[in-house]
Interface confidence: low
């Protein structure tokens, strides 16, 4: 039975040209985390593997930095970065937990962090 929950940074906004940290936190489970994937729609951005650490997809190497922790930092943001991002925790024996973050990249300086929320 999957008992864990993923807490994410929720709906967030940031300014064009700036950077943002995407964070997910898995709690309420004793499962072993084997790998965390970060994806944007259908594109793989990065992987953090329990044995071998981080791998950033070549097409994102210039704008994606691993961390802090199991999070992901997006840099040099463009309006095209607006959209859904997913953290996918691969665990044993529970299976896969997925958290969703919606990022809006704004032209002006009205960027403001949204509230935190939980996904079961």
């Amino acid at each position: 039975m999957m008992t864990g929950t993923i807490e994410t940074t929720g709906n967030i906004s940031a300014e064009k040209g700036g950077s943002i940290i995407l964070q997910c936190h898995l709690s309420s489970t004793t499962a072993q985390v084997t790998q965390v994937n970060w994806e944007q729609q259908d594109q793989l951005l990065a992987i953090c593997n329990a044995d071998l650490g981080w791998h950033i997809s070549p097409s994102f190497k210039d704008r994606v930095a691993p961390g802090p922790g199991l999070g992901l930092t997006l840099q040099s943001l463009t309006v095209n970065d607006t959209g859904e991002y997913f953290c996918i925790y691969h665990t044993y024996p529970d299976g896969t937990y997925t958290g969703r973050i919606f990022l809006e990249v704004l032209e002006s300086s009205v960027a403001e962090h949204g509230a935190r929320f939980q996904i079961p």
Epitope: T29, Q32, C48, G53, W54
Partner: antibody, heavy 116, light 107 residues
Framework: EVQLQESGPELVKPGASVKISCKAS????????MLWVKQSHVKSLEWIGR????????TYNQNFKDKASLTVNKSSSTAYMELHSLTSEDSAVYYC?????????WGQGTTLTVSS | DIQMTQSPSSLSASLGERVSLTCRAS??????LSWLQQKPDGTIKRLIY???TLDSGVPKRFSGSRSGSDYSLTISSLESEDFADYYC?????????FGSGTKLEIK
């Protein structure tokens, strides 16, 4: 906040055994490997082995296979390392470290002195 | 086992100076290398992982790079809190192995 609190300094006699503890807090203990490292004046830093707190599975450095035993107590979120048949060469500082793809957090170290 | 040959073993430098430490891997480690800093009180902290990725909160004067089997840690402008011991670590294969360390002292 992630914390790894190791047990205090130990003074033990040659031939004896000692059990060092590393209490984890601030994260899901069973979600991440725990590693142990020895630091001595002779050989600098040496990787002893790792344990998966979820199922107790261990991987040892062959140099420490007969010297160290790694265990965990999930209910208290504590990792243990027992060192056997101690000699003066085992005098060192021993560190536990949380692992996820890399050492990302270290305990403060436990000093072990083996002396008659 | 993979041997990590670290140099120099000690280094005396002045505040504001640029310094580089090097570790050479005896076998291919594919970039799976970290740099650790140990303060005089024994506290160990990871500075860099995966050859060149700075840990959260680590000042940007620290950087890591690779040239073949040689891995380097560079401090662009030394500050007083940088005087400490530094170790490289390979985690490409078991057993994980460390360099012998570099003691960075104030001149």
């Amino acid at each position: 906040e992630v914390q790894l609190q190791e047990s205090g300094p130990e003074l033990v006699k040659p031939g004896a055994s000692v059990k060092i503890s590393c209490k984890a807090s601030g994260y899901s203990f069973t979600g991440y490997y725990m590693l142990w490292v020895k630091q001595s004046h002779v050989k600098s830093l040496e990787w002893i082995g790792r344990i998966n707190p979820y199922n107790g599975a261990t991987t040892y450095n062959q140099n420490f296979k007969d010297k160290a035993s790694l265990t965990v107590n999930k209910s208290s979120s504590t990792a243990y390392m027992e060192l056997h048949s101690l000699t003066s060469e085992d005098s060192a500082v021993y560190y536990c470290a949380r692992w996820f793809g890399d050492f990302d957090f270290w305990g403060q170290g436990t000093t072990l002195t083996v002396s008659s | 086992d993979i041997q990590m040959t670290q140099s120099p073993s000690s280094l005396s430098a002045s505040l504001g100076e640029r310094v580089s430490l090097t570790c050479r891997a005896s076998q291919e480690i594919s970039g799976y290398l970290s740099w650790l800093q140990q303060k005089p009180d024994g506290t160990i902290k990871r500075l860099i992982y995966a050859t060149s990725t700075l840990d959260s909160g680590v000042p940007k004067r620290f950087s890591g790079s690779r040239s073949g089997s040689d891995y380097s840690l560079t401090i662009s402008s030394l500050e007083s809190e940088d005087f400490a011991d530094y170790y490289c670590l390979q985690y490409a294969s078991y057993p994980f192995t460390f360099g012998s360390g570099t003691k960075l002292e104030i001149k």
